[in-house]
Interface confidence: low
């Protein structure tokens, strides 16, 4: 973006323009209109005749010289005024915008120009005085005048060389600006190289993070396996105890047979007397299949079955259809209970859904739907909601009417795009709709302007990713 332009403007002034970054320096040098070209009949550096001239010729000659002097004087005054006017403006701009080195050069040039112009003006004043005196005594001083005109011509030549010097200084400044441009380009290249190196580092870190995430997933899987083994052991122990108690009761009829109790949801757990928050084993309706869920026995009267929790980003929610079907994560931390269980449960009786949200500024809000159920897998676990109340927006951030569930490998949304792939996580996407509580988890100070984050539009608006979310269900008649 540094450039240098040299052109003629419409009035015939020579224009020098130096562009450097946001600074633009323009030198308008007026041409000496009345200075004769080499093709004109009078040649300024012609050899003077020593013999006295005819009076009339002399007068004519002097008038020509006087005109030249007058024109030169006017031209120099114009140049001086122009420099004085423009240097004031230029100095202010230069002081504000230019590099220190450049400023120094410009001030130096300005000072030199002013000094030289003043000097030339003084010289011209002296010369003019001499010429005026000589004209009154022309008849007596023709020979002396001949020498004087010679001196005047020499001064005109000096002024011309001064102008050439000025132009040389301009071209020197030109070169300096171009050199600065080259230096700037080199600096930009090195910055770009550093940036590229940083990007390589970032991509390396990303791959390390991905590896770590995979290891965490593996660890979670291993943990689940261990929990399953522990569960199986407990079952075996219970069976043994049952067998023992059965044989004992056969011998002693007074000992009653211990009943094995199963719970469908946390409301049943609560009603059975277990009023402490924690993980409980629930049984699928009309089945012996079991699932572990976290029960909130304190909030709003207790008995809440937690079906989703986000709190720290420790679990990857960009999962497959099958994983969202059966559930994943850790019930004591971040987890998804499972669409199949929730679908079966909510089709047995009427349930309410409460969604509790936290932002990064310490605010909390909730949305409560007085009727909630999920369709079967055949109908893509479509969500059905009615009767919204709460503080997290007067409008439902889960699009109404309900949409089918979508995952990265099961695109059932209403968009040409694949919402789940784009926004990450499985959700009841519309096209793509104003919410996604299973999006990417973003930490504080990185949680704004993120469209694939944890969204609840009608509470926090676009691009805000929440700190924590909990989705919980409870029978409507609890």
């Amino acid at each position: 973006y540094n450039n240098f332009r040299k052109s003629m403007d419409s009035i015939g002034k020579k224009q020098y323009q130096v562009q450097h970054g946001s600074c633009s320096y323009t030198f308008l040098l007026p041409e000496m209109d009345n200075c004769r070209s080499s093709s004109s009949p009078y040649v300024s550096n012609a050899v003077q005749r020593d013999a006295p001239l005819e009076y009339d010729d002399s007068v004519q000659r002097l008038q020509v010289l006087e005109n030249i002097m007058e024109n030169n004087t006017q031209w120099l005054m114009k140049l001086e005024n122009y420099i004085q006017d423009n240097m004031k403006k230029e100095m202010v701009e230069i002081q504000q915008n230019a590099v220190q080195n450049q400023t120094a050069v410009m001030i130096e040039i300005g000072t030199n120009l002013l000094n030289q112009t003043a000097e030339q003006t003084r010289k011209l004043t002296d010369v003019e005085a001499q010429v005026l005196n000589q004209t009154t005594r022309l008849e007596l001083q023709l020979l002396e005048h001949s020498l004087s005109t010679n001196k005047l011509e020499k001064q005109i030549l000096d002024q011309t060389s001064e102008i050439n010097k000025l132009q040389d200084k301009n071209s020197f400044l030109e070169k300096k600006v171009l050199a600065m441009e080259d230096k700037h380009i080199i600096q930009l290249q090195s910055i770009k190289e550093e940036k590229d190196q940083l990007q390589v580092l970032v991509s390396k870190q990303n791959s390390i993070i991905e590896e770590l995430e995979k290891k965490i997933v593996t660890a979670t899987v291993n943990n689940s396996v261990l929990q399953k083994q522990q569960h199986d052991l407990m079952e075996t122990v219970n069976n043994l105890l049952t067998m023992m108690s059965t044989s004992n009761s056969a011998k002693d009829p007074t000992v009653a047979k211990e009943e094995q109790i199963s719970f469908r949801d946390c409301a049943e757990v609560f009603k059975s007397g277990h009023t402490t928050n924690g993980i409980y084993t629930l049984t699928f309706p009309n089945s012996t299949e079991e699932i572990k869920a976290y029960c909130d026995m304190e909030a709003g009267g207790g008995g809440w079955t937690i079906i989703q929790r986000r709190e720290d980003g420790s679990v990857d929610f960009q999962r497959t259809w099958k994983e969202y079907k059966v559930g994943f994560g850790n019930p004591s931390g971040e987890y998804w209970l499972g669409n199949e269980f929730v679908s079966q449960l909510t089709n047995q009786q009427r349930y309410v859904l409460k969604i509790h949200l936290k932002d990064w500024e310490g605010n909390e809000a909730y949305s409560l739907y007085e009727h909630f159920y999920l369709s079967s897998e055949e109908l893509n676990y479509r969500i059905h909601l009615k009767g919204l109340t709460g503080t997290a927006g007067k409008i439902s951030s889960i699009s109404q009417p309900g949409n089918d569930f979508s995952t990265k490998d099961g695109d059932n949304d209403k968009c040409i795009c694949k919402c789940s792939q784009m926004l990450t996580g499985g959700w009841w996407f519309d096209a793509c709709g104003p919410s996604n509580l299973n999006g990417m988890y973003y930490p504080q100070r990185q949680n704004t302007n993120k469209f694939n984050g944890i969204k609840w539009y009608y509470w926090k608006g676009s691009g805000y990713s929440l700190k924590a979310t909990t989705m919980m269900i409870r029978p409507a008649d609890f």
Epitope: G433, P434, N449, Y458, G461, G463
Partner: antibody, heavy 122, light 107 residues
Framework: DVQLVESGGGLAQPGGSRKLSCAAS????????MHWVRQAPEKGLDWVAY????????YYADTVKGRFTISRDNPKNTLFLQMTSLRSEDTAMYYC???????????????WGQGTSVTVSS | DIQMTQSPASQSASLGESVTITCLAS???GTWLAWYQQKPGKSPQL??????SLADGVPSRFSGSGSGTKFSLKISSLQAEDFVSYYC?????????IGAGTKLELK
């Protein structure tokens, strides 16, 4: 039918002030984030400011930060842009635009007003 | 801030021809990109969002592609009303940034 009508443009002195309004109709104004975008004569589009549906989130372009203030009056379905310390480079056509609620769209401006012209000159 | 570089600044084409306008983002923005059309003296209109999704009422001759940092808008079988200006906008983060625009001219 969604309609956005800007007003308040005109001639302003450098260093002066001007308040633009945008009257919205045909949709539930309080549900949508709103933006101001400007376009200098014969130039491209330049984003100015954003306000969320409930006014809890506000953003500005660096060029106007500290000089312009975006606000809204949801009951009156009106968006405002208070401009102070105006400069010649603020001369432009100012559009108000509605942001889509679709998450997949991000900050997509799905409806725009016809614009109001602001000229800053002495 | 994310810089959006749009090219070409202007392009000449004939009726019925196809043209492609490109937009480069200074950092990866996934598919968070929109294209707008602006007719002289009018306000911009949304053409494409999410890099590839066509906005309501937009003719199918307009199509968007790309992800990450490189995006393009293709207009096939140009009609007379298509010879206007087009802008790309990143939708990913504030400040919202918009390309300098491409003016489509009739040959």
């Amino acid at each position: 039918d969604v309609q956005l009508v800007e007003s308040g443009g005109g001639l302003a002195q450098p260093g002066g002030s001007r308040k633009l309004s945008c009257a919205a109709s045909g949709f539930t104004f309080s549900n949508f984030g709103m933006h101001w975008v400007r376009q200098a004569p014969e130039k491209g589009l330049d984003w100015v400011a954003y306000i969320s549906s409930g006014s809890d989130t506000i953003y500005y372009a660096d060029t106007v930060k500290g000089r312009f203030t975006i606000s809204r009056d949801n009951p009156k379905n009106t968006l405002f842009l208070q401009m102070t310390s105006l400069r010649s480079e603020d001369t432009a056509m100012y559009y108000c635009a509605r942001e889509s609620t679709m998450i997949t769209m991000g900050y997509v401006l799905d409806y725009w007003g016809q614009g109001t012209s602001v000229t800053v000159s002495s | 801030d994310i810089q959006m570089t749009q090219s070409p600044a202007s392009q000449s084409a004939s009726l019925g021809e196809s043209v492609t306008i490109t937009c480069l983002a200074s950092q990866t923005i996934g598919t968070w990109l929109a294209w707008y059309q602006q007719k002289p003296g009018k306000s911009p209109q949304l053409l494409i969002y999410a890099a590839t999704s066509l906005a309501d009422g937009v003719p199918s001759r307009f199509s968007g592609s790309g992800s990450g940092t490189k995006f393009s808008l293709k207009i096939s079988s140009l009609q007379a009303e298509d010879f206007v200006s087009y802008y790309c906008q990143q939708l990913y983060s504030i400040p919202l940034t918009i390309g300098a625009g491409t003016k489509l001219e009739l040959k």
